[in-house]
């Protein structure tokens, strides 16, 4: 004969555990039903009655099967430097991620605690490693024969154009100027953007113009090309 199916609440056999989506209530000493995602325990079970569940109120959620007395509060609204990538529902918390042009400088369990603007490499420097959702741009000095004349978080160092006759030699921050009407060939056709980065952890020691980085949020820096612009918190 098949074993009789026990309905909650029930007393578990000694040494056994409650089934999936059930929990052991210490007070009632019974296996009782959990509440489904989007609900919470309104009334805990007793020896004779099962858990009573109720829907989460607005701006609260439960993501897992649970027996919590109250749903969790959704995080605060996303700040101005963030976008909401997951809305607050009864079953999931709001998730805020950094908006385009920014990266997450300090993450939290889900989403981002501190967003900061991507570093812009100044003229003479190009992007060595592009920014990602969670890492800043890395800049490097333009090597001989290349240049960058922009302040940009995407432009790499580009080769100088090759001239029949050079009027002004190029340098790290300026392209070569040719005297002839057109160069032999142009190696630098407009702004070049780096492809998506390879996320590797490197330990450069840059004897040649290798990358190196500097902050990219402009907030507490009192002077000049404000490095970091202070990011905002997404709590």
């Amino acid at each position: 004969l098949p074993a009789q199916v026990a309905f909650t609440p029930y007393a578990p056999e000694p040494g056994s555990t409650c089934r999936l989506r059930e929990y052991y209530d210490q007070t009632a000493q019974m296996c009782c039903s959990k509440c489904s995602p989007g609900q919470h325990a309104k009334v805990f079970c007793t020896k004779t009655s099962d858990t009573v569940c109720d829907s989460c109120e607005d701006s609260t959620y439960t993501q897992l099967w649970n027996w919590v007395p109250e749903c969790l509060s959704c995080g605060s609204r996303c700040s101005s430097d963030q976008v909401e990538t997951q809305a607050c529902t009864r079953e999931q918390n709001r998730i805020c991620t950094c908006r385009p042009g920014w990266y997450c400088a300090l993450s939290k369990q889900e989403g981002c605690r501190l967003c900061a603007p991507l570093r812009k490499c100044r003229p003479g420097f190009g992007v060595a490693r592009p920014g990602t959702e969670t890492s800043d741009v890395v800049c490097k000095p333009c090597a001989p024969g290349t240049f960058s004349n922009t302040t940009s978080s995407t432009d790499i160092c580009r080769p100088h154009q090759i001239c029949n006759v050079v009027a002004i030699p190029g340098n790290a921050s300026m392209d070569a100027v040719c005297t002839s009407t057109s160069p032999t060939r142009s190696m630098a056709p407009g702004a070049v953007h780096l492809p998506q980065p390879v996320s590797t952890r490197s330990q450069h020691t840059q004897p040649t113009p290798e990358p190196s980085t500097a902050p990219s949020t402009s907030f507490l820096l009192p002077m000049g090309p404000s490095p970091p612009a202070e990011g905002s918190t997404g709590d």
């Epitope: 570093r119 490499c121 000095p141 902050p215 002077m223 202070e230």
Partner: antibody, heavy 121, light 107 residues
Framework: EVQLVESGGGLVQPGGSLRLSCAAS????????LSWVRQAPGKGLEWVAY????????YYSDTVKGRFTISRDNAKNTLYLQMNSLRAEDTAVYYC??????????????WGQGTLVTVSS | DIQMTQSPSSLSASVGDRVTITCRTS??????LPWYQQKPGKAPKLLIY???KLAEGVPSRFSGSGSGTDYTLTISSLQPEDFATYYC?????????FGQGTKVEIK
């Protein structure tokens, strides 16, 4: 107010190790690049090591490469310098400095008070 | 490595004097040059960055000039609190070297 406070200096024998720490406050630590600069007694300044804001890029001076390791813990707002195989010529005051925001803002804008490392037998 | 040649190594001057310190690099550093002031027993302090820009809170008697390989720090009218050691530094390719320093002493 931006503050950088170094600790961990002291007397160590040649060949020994030391770990310096720098506790930072008053700014969004995880968005800034940081460096260590040292100054031997009565001598000039020498840049030692650099780490970018995310800890992905590190650079070292040739004099310490392979012996020193710079690291950071953005959750603890702390910068570190692990110094191994120490030599007499590493004796100096070690400064924790903010910057450069390399490629964008190229300067050291805040300095700690320094911690003295003495390598001697 | 880029060599930094700072001169003079020391100078004696009086309050009110105009003081000029020069820094020459072995190759162009594209104005990626700050100047620092250091007083005995203290950490250095940023004075000038990008060769010509005055850092926050620094008196206007300090000024920087230059480009390419030649840079100058000028103190237009030396004050008692300006007696210190001054360093230039480059931020082009690593290693980021400092000049040897210029000690400004009271005449």
């Amino acid at each position: 107010e931006v503050q950088l406070v170094e600790s961990g200096g002291g007397l160590v024998q040649p060949g020994g190790s030391l770990r310096l720490s720098c506790a930072a406050s008053g700014f969004a630590f995880s968005t800034y690049d940081l460096s260590w600069v040292r100054q031997a007694p009565g001598k000039g300044l020498e840049w030692v090591a650099y780490i970018n804001n995310g800890g992905i890029s590190t650079y070292y001076s040739d004099t310490v490469k392979g012996r020193f390791t710079i690291s950071r813990d953005n959750a603890k707002n702390t910068l570190y310098l692990q110094m191994n195989s120490l030599r007499a010529e590493d004796t100096a005051v070690y400064y924790c400095v903010r910057g450069p925001f390399y490629g964008s803002a190229n300067y050291f804008d805040y300095w700690g008070q320094g911690t003295l490392v003495t390598v001697s037998s | 490595d880029i060599q930094m040649t700072q001169s003079p190594s020391s100078l004696s001057a009086s309050v009110g004097d105009r003081v000029t310190i020069t820094c020459r690099t072995s190759e162009s550093i594209y104005s990626n040059l700050p100047w620092y002031q250091q007083k005995p027993g203290k950490a250095p302090k940023l004075l000038i960055y990008d060769a010509t820009k005055l850092a926050e809170g620094v008196p206007s008697r300090f000024s920087g000039s230059g480009s390419g390989t030649d840079y100058t720090l000028t103190i237009s009218s030396l004050q008692p609190e300006d007696f210190a050691t001054y360093y230039c530094q480059h931020f082009w390719v690593t290693p980021w070297t400092f000049g040897q320093g210029t000690k400004v002493e009271i005449k």
